[in-house]
């Protein structure tokens, strides 16, 4: 705590300006009125205060607003935002997207800090859902944002927001997250024609069920191998050799290079070898001709 000392004569700040950078910490504490600081927060950013001086300014605001800063102050915090702790931010009620953008701008180019994560969480919870404009803003600053959310949090994303998602925003999503996002994307894009639909849905296909992959195989979509390798294994297993051939089109040749990796490996094990041979790729490991496939779950059911 900075000691409470009287402001020296003639040093009382009438406005927030560059002269304050020459004030010692105790002088800032004594001579800058907190209410004045709050109304002229927009000026702080333009003045090259030291970190120690910023600590004093933050302390003054904390004293003025012990229950949390009003949005009019938050919007103009600028670099002072970097001094805030997650505990400070939890007291805020941020409702304006402009405020959110202003604070994210301060942290631009850096990893998502605990402060930013808390800010976003407060903002989204305040809105009740992750709407399109918010998602647009967040993914612009943090392309990996969507994949940092839990499946439970993703369930609050309305299908209309999916239009804001770019392929790179899904790069780090795991299957559980795509399981939640895929049905939303399917709903969002279903009014498009078949070929346009595939372009839009492609990034989300890691969450697609078997029936939708079978439907895509009827559409001559020519899925690339990278997309195929991200598909759910359980969704791929029921696909026939003919369906996979139609689904991949000219990319089917890439299966050979991936035959030891999931989901290709597991899919091969479920196919008849003579069906695999029709691809002419030399894929091995299918069920030999004339062999019976024993399903252990079925054996258990019958016993």
């Amino acid at each position: 705590e900075v000691e409470k000392t009287a402001c020296p004569s003639g040093k009382k700040a009438r406005e927030i300006d560059e002269s304050l950078i020459f004030y010692k910490k105790w002088e800032l504490e004594a001579c800058v009125d907190a209410a004045l600081l709050a109304t002229q927060m927009d000026r702080v950013n333009a003045i090259p205060f030291t970190y120690e001086q910023l600590d004093v300014l933050k302390h003054k605001l904390d004293e003025l607003y012990p229950q949390g800063y009003p949005e009019s102050v938050i919007q103009h915090l600028g670099y002072l935002f970097l001094k805030m702790s997650p505990e400070d931010i939890r007291k805020w009620n941020v409702t304006s997207l402009e405020t959110l953008k202003a604070l994210l701008e301060v942290n631009k180019g850096h990893e998502m800090s605990p402060q930013v994560a808390t800010l976003i969480d407060r903002f989204v919870k305040g809105r009740g859902q992750l709407d399109k404009d918010t998602l647009d803003t967040l993914t612009a600053f943090y392309p990996g944002y969507l994949c940092s959310l839990s499946p439970e949090e993703l369930s609050s994303v309305p299908p209309s927001s999916i239009w804001a998602v770019r392929p790179q925003d899904l790069d780090t999503c795991d299957p559980r997250q795509l399981d939640v996002l895929y049905p939303k994307a399917r709903l969002a894009f279903q009014n498009m024609n078949g070929s346009e639909y595939f372009v839009k849905i492609q990034s989300f296909l890691g969450g697609a069920p078997t029936e939708d992959l079978k439907a895509l195989s009827q559409q001559n979509v020519s899925m690339d191998l990278a997309t195929f390798m991200k598909l759910r294994t359980d969704a791929v297993l029921p696909l026939t050799v003919a369906e996979v051939q139609k689904l991949l089109g000219p990319h089917v040749e890439g299966l050979k290079a991936e035959e030891r990796h999931r989901p290709v490996r597991d899919w091969i094990l479920r196919q008849r070898q003579d069906d695999l041979d029709t691809l002419g790729l030399g894929l091995q490991g299918g069920i030999p001709n004339g062999y019976l496939v024993l399903d252990l779950s079925m054996q258990e059911a019958l016993s």
Epitope: R186, Q190, N191, G194, Y197, T210, E211, D212, K214, A215, L216, Q218, Q219, L237, P238, T240, R270, R272, S297
Partner: antibody, heavy 122, light 107 residues
Framework: QVQLVESGGGVVQPGRSLRLSCAAS????????MHWVRQAPGKGLEWVAA????????YYADSVKGRFTISRDNSKNMLYLQMNSLRAEDTAVYYC???????????????WGQGTLVTVSS | EIVLTQSPDFQSVTPKEKVTITCRAS??????LHWYRQKPDQSPKLLIK???QSFSGVPSRFSGGGSGTDFTLTINSLEAEDAATYYC?????????FGQGTKVEIK
Amino acid sequence: QVQLVESGGGVVQPGRSLRLSCAASGFTFSSYGMHWVRQAPGKGLEWVAAIWYDGSNKYYADSVKGRFTISRDNSKNMLYLQMNSLRAEDTAVYYCARDLSIFGVVILSDYWGQGTLVTVSS
Amino acid sequence: EIVLTQSPDFQSVTPKEKVTITCRASQSIGSSLHWYRQKPDQSPKLLIKYASQSFSGVPSRFSGGGSGTDFTLTINSLEAEDAATYYCHQSSSLPWTFGQGTKVEIK
């Protein structure tokens, strides 16, 4: 919510024609394959016909091929089954059903109408 | 066309009992076998898709297994509301076909 309502059933003489309709609502009709399935009184289910989302492909059971025609009007969210040269064995409750997938004819979904009864009798 | 044969045709079971219905295809259909339940005066409802995939909202007591030509539907602990006719259905090749149905009655 998804709703499928069949109409057009009734009593008809052998050799005559009948047209069944199915009004769809609660989903983007133009994105889904559609089916007709029938069930003779006290008997099992029989798949009758299917049509692609855009009407470009149609499929039929052997028992109705050449006699029945499936069609759709996406502007009206309507599915149709034109039944010609009706026989006594066509007597059944006719259900329209939506495909589970989007942009394909892949698997019958959980969405079926309540059915309309067609009785072929002299 | 592919013929699906279910067994048994009829089963009378006490509540909480385990029920197993089998479906045999006349030729290999991979995993393109689905199970439906039809209660009296209602349209059918999908239970299991692609042999073993549970359909959303279906109670966990229903499970499916098998591939190729032999398939099973298992109801682990039968409840009163499970009294219905159960159908297997193949979408592997046209024309699509159904089994003749298995009627499950509660004792």
